[in-house]
């Protein structure tokens, strides 16, 4: 299963779309910066088997998809870009699911790393809480967009390391 190669390309396309989605100047949003506590340690370890690593990436993409599929998100972002972004994420999720099924027969380790997936879930809960507290303001969404771009970039490094391990 050559997921890391195809996923890396999808990740790049998703990042480009995210970059294009900006609606307001981020310079007006500096005071809205927030520490979401990206679970870096979950993307640092080499302890993962491939299926486990993919399941953590899958959770991150799934949570991002959920976040940008809300009605508040639809009211904020330009519709055609949002649709392209959602389609790209959906394709990545499908690719990952197919890949995990393939890997199950190859590995004897557990399919999921429960602690890592929980850490990713909590990270997105903090993002959602921040948006709620900021009443889904344009600046709050701008900060979240920047954070998601950063987390995608950090997970890209993780994917590249995964590819080198193969």
């Amino acid at each position: 299963c050559d997921l890391p190669q195809t996923h890396s390309l999808g990740n790049r396309r998703a990042l480009i779309l995210l970059a294009q989605m900006g609606r307001i100047s981020p310079f007006s949003c500096l005071k809205d910066r927030h520490d979401f506590g990206f679970p870096q340690e979950e993307f640092d370890g080499n302890q993962f088997q491939k299926a486990q690593a993919i399941s953590v990436l899958h959770e991150m993409i799934q949570q991002t998809f959920n976040l940008f599929s809300t009605k508040d998100s639809s009211a904020t972002w330009e519709q055609s870009l949002l649709e392209k972004f959602s389609t790209e994420l959906n394709q990545q999720l499908n690719d990952m699911e197919a890949c995990v099924i393939q890997e199950v027969g190859v590995e004897e380790t557990p399919l999921m790393n429960v602690d890592s997936i929980l850490a990713v879930k909590k990270y997105f809960q903090r993002i959602t809480l921040y948006l709620t507290e900021k009443k889904y303001s344009p600046c709050a969404w701008e900060v979240v967009r920047a954070e998601i771009m950063r987390s995608f970039s950090l997970s890209k490094i993780f994917q590249e390391r995964l590819r080198r391990k193969e």
Epitope: G22, L30, K31, V143, A146, E147, S153
Partner: antibody, heavy 121, light 107 residues
Framework: EVQLVQSGAEVKKPGESLKISCKGS????????IGWVRQMPGKGLEWMGI????????AYSPSFQGQVTISADKSISTAYLQWSSLKASDTAMYYC??????????????WGQGTLVTVSS | DIQMTQSPSSLSASVGDRVTITCRAS??????LNWYQQKPGKAPKLLIY???SLQSGVPSRFSGSGSGTDFTLTISSLQPEDFATYYC?????????FGQGTKVEIK
């Protein structure tokens, strides 16, 4: 290794134009903003302005608005600071530094080595 | 614009001394404050960001505290290489502004 490398020292006459550069390497150039800071001889640090290289959006300090222009060419990972008509009072050391934008990360964590601009008739 | 006022503007201290520099903002900036060290002829170096986070590679004798309008940079035991000028900078809103600097000299 993250690096910001600035162009060399310049000696100019009043009224001349100038464009100095700051080339980033070792990181994703469009993921960080680039700020410019002035330091006049024997004085403190003054923030001039900033650019988001991903879309060339800029913000200036009111003290420098209209006096300088900040630009970037993301294809060569380079930011620029330019003057159309230099004054003797522009004599200073100019630094570029990277800024994490809206991300919760260290501000101005890497700096260029500085470009000394001397304006004298 | 947010004004940043540092005190003292200069101080004399000996190796091993505990040194404290303060920075006051003209309005609340939450914890959006950075501290830089600059030596003659060199670019500034980030020491502390978001008021109290130690930048990677910076010795633990440097620490920062404060929130709102009042902030402090502390050097717990001054070393020979710490004689320099220190600047605070608010990163709460544009235009970004620096304090006027505090020069730490050898007594």
């Amino acid at each position: 290794e993250v690096q910001l490398v600035q162009s060399g020292a310049e000696v100019k006459k009043p009224g001349e134009s100038l464009k100095i550069s700051c080339k980033g390497s070792g990181y994703s150039f469009t993921s960080y903003w680039i700020g410019w800071v002035r330091q006049m001889p024997g004085k403190g640090l003054e923030w001039m302005g900033i650019i988001d290289p991903s879309d060339s959006d800029t913000a200036y300090s009111p003290s420098f608005q209209g006096q300088v222009t900040i630009s970037a060419d993301k294809s060569i990972s380079t930011a620029y600071l330019q003057w159309s008509s230099l004054k003797a009072s522009d004599t200073a050391m100019y630094y570029c530094a990277r800024h994490p934008g809206l991300n919760w990360a260290p501000d101005f964590d890497y700096w260029g080595q500085g470009t000394l601009v001397t304006v004298s008739s | 614009d947010i004004q940043m006022t540092q005190s003292p503007s200069s101080l004399s201290a000996s190796v091993g001394d505990r040194v404290t520099i303060t920075c006051r903002a003209s309005q609340s900036i939450d914890g959006s404050l950075n501290w830089y060290q600059q030596k003659p002829g060199k670019a500034p170096k980030l020491l502390i960001y978001f008021a109290s986070s130690l930048q990677s590679g910076v010795p633990s004798r440097f620490s920062g505290s404060g929130s709102g309008t009042d902030f402090t940079l502390t050097i717990s035991s001054l070393q020979p290489e710490d004689f320099a000028t220190y600047y605070c900078q608010q990163s709460y809103d544009f235009p970004l502004t620096f304090g006027q600097g505090t020069k730490v000299e050898i007594k």
